[in-house]
Interface confidence: medium
């Protein structure tokens, strides 16, 4: 399976909400011996590989933000912990999974990574990740709402606040 990032760059004004999205697709074994672990974290563009470093998002680690389920089931993170930090990660039946960040500040700017781990019964594991940049802007140059730039082309798209 693969992970696609719908947008490679999100540019948002301070105070806005944004939903960063990844999609995983490809053959998925829905058997009882396969489970999916999905999560989000911040990172930096490393020399060897992007997303190898896993930093917290607003003090929540990738373990705090993880979604864990079999097949294409929908899932949500623990509401209490994440929502206290203005965060929520979610997953739907179609392979989309996202993290919503509320009331953005300049400190939220950076590289965000989504990670999907397919864990097979016994010991097989397959890991893929996607990366996207979030730029939070303030002042007169800031957009009035979030603008998302698609991964495949430079056409931008206005996205509504979450």
């Amino acid at each position: 399976f693969k992970v696609a990032t719908l947008y490679s760059l999100y540019v948002c004004p301070e105070g806005q909400n944004v939903t960063l999205t990844c999609r995983f697709f490809g053959p998925v074994d829905k058997g009882h011996d396969v489970t999916f672990y999905k999560t989000w974290y911040r990172s930096s563009r490393g020399e060897v590989q992007t997303c190898s470093e896993r930093r917290p998002i607003r003090n929540l680690t990738f373990q705090d933000l993880h979604l864990h389920h079999g097949g294409h089931q929908a899932a949500n993170t623990s509401h209490d912990l994440a929502q206290r930090h203005g965060l929520e990660s979610a997953s739907d039946h179609h392979g989309n999974f996202s993290i919503t960040m509320r009331n953005l500040t300049l400190l939220d700017s950076g590289l965000y990574c989504c990670l999907v781990v397919e864990i097979r019964h016994h010991h097989s594991e397959h890991r893929v990740h996607g990366a996207m940049e979030l730029q939070v802007q303030t002042g007169k140059d800031a957009p009035s709402s979030c603008v998302a730039y698609p991964s495949s082309s430079q056409e931008s798209e206005n996205i509504t606040a979450a």
Partner: antibody, heavy 120, light 107 residues
Framework: QVQLVQSGAEVKKPGSSVKVSCKAS????????ISWVRQAPGQGLEWMGG????????NYAQKFQGRVTITADESTSTAYMELSSLRSEDTAVYYC?????????????WGQGTLVTVSS | DIQMTQSPSSLSASVGDRVTITCRAS??????LNWYQQKPGKAPKLLIY???SLQSGVPSRFSGSGSGTDFTLTISSLQPEDFATYYC?????????FGQGTKVEIK
């Protein structure tokens, strides 16, 4: 804060078995692999095997295959390691260690260790 | 099995020294390498994961580098609490294997 608390020290006779427990608290138990790593006196670290509680079936190092059994009880958030046919060279400190996710094998939390002494 | 070879097996250094420990894998493990610190009577502590990423809460004087078969752990300025034994560990394939350890002693 995640904590792994292991059972107390054991003294065993050669040929017998020992079962060491590892109780996890402060985090989701089922999603993470728990491995067992041993360390003989003055020696290095040796991985014995591990288990992801949601699956229940363990993955063992070939060296210990047939002699070690790793299990997990999700209801009590406890993992167990049983080693049979003990010999003197099994005298070691046995650690349980949690992988940061799945079978990632980076051990971010460790138990305090359980000393198992095999002596006649 | 993947063999992990650390060097040196022991070293003597003073507070403030720059210390480098190397680890070599018998076959390529990409960046699936972790470093641990262990003090006598204590469990190991994860310092570096994925060859170069600093584990949360670990001082920035610790750094890791390398990929493939050759890896390095560097302590930029040795502190009194850093005197311990350091282990590398490959996480590429089972059985998981560790280096034999490097003991860092006070000169």
């Amino acid at each position: 804060q995640v904590q792994l608390v292991q059972s107390g020290a054991e003294v065993k006779k050669p040929g017998s078995s020992v079962k060491v427990s590892c109780k996890a608290s402060g985090g989701t138990f089922s999603s993470y692999a728990i491995s067992w790593v041993r360390q003989a006196p003055g020696q290095g670290l040796e991985w014995m095997g591990g288990i992801i509680p949601i699956f229940g079936t363990a993955n063992y190092a070939q060296k210990f295959q047939g002699r070690v059994t790793i299990t997990a009880d999700e209801s009590t958030s406890t993992a167990y390691m049983e080693l049979s046919s003990l010999r003197s060279e099994d005298t070691a400190v046995y650690y349980c260690a949690r992988s940061s996710y799945g079978w990632s094998y980076e051990f971010d939390y460790w138990g305090q260790g359980t000393l198992v002494t095999v002596s006649s | 099995d993947i063999q992990m070879t650390q060097s040196p097996s022991s070293l003597s250094a003073s507070v403030g020294d720059r210390v480098t420990i190397t680890c070599r894998a018998s076959q390529s493990i990409n960046t699936n390498l972790n470093w641990y610190q262990q003090k006598p009577g204590k469990a190991p502590k994860l310092l570096i994961y994925a060859a170069s990423s600093l584990q949360s809460g670990v001082p920035s004087r610790f750094s890791g580098s390398g990929s493939g078969t050759d890896f390095t752990l560097t302590i930029s300025s040795l502190q009194p609490e850093d005197f311990a034994t350091y282990y590398c560990q490959q996480a590429r394939d089972t059985p998981i294997t560790f280096g034999q350890g490097t003991k860092v002693e006070i000169k």
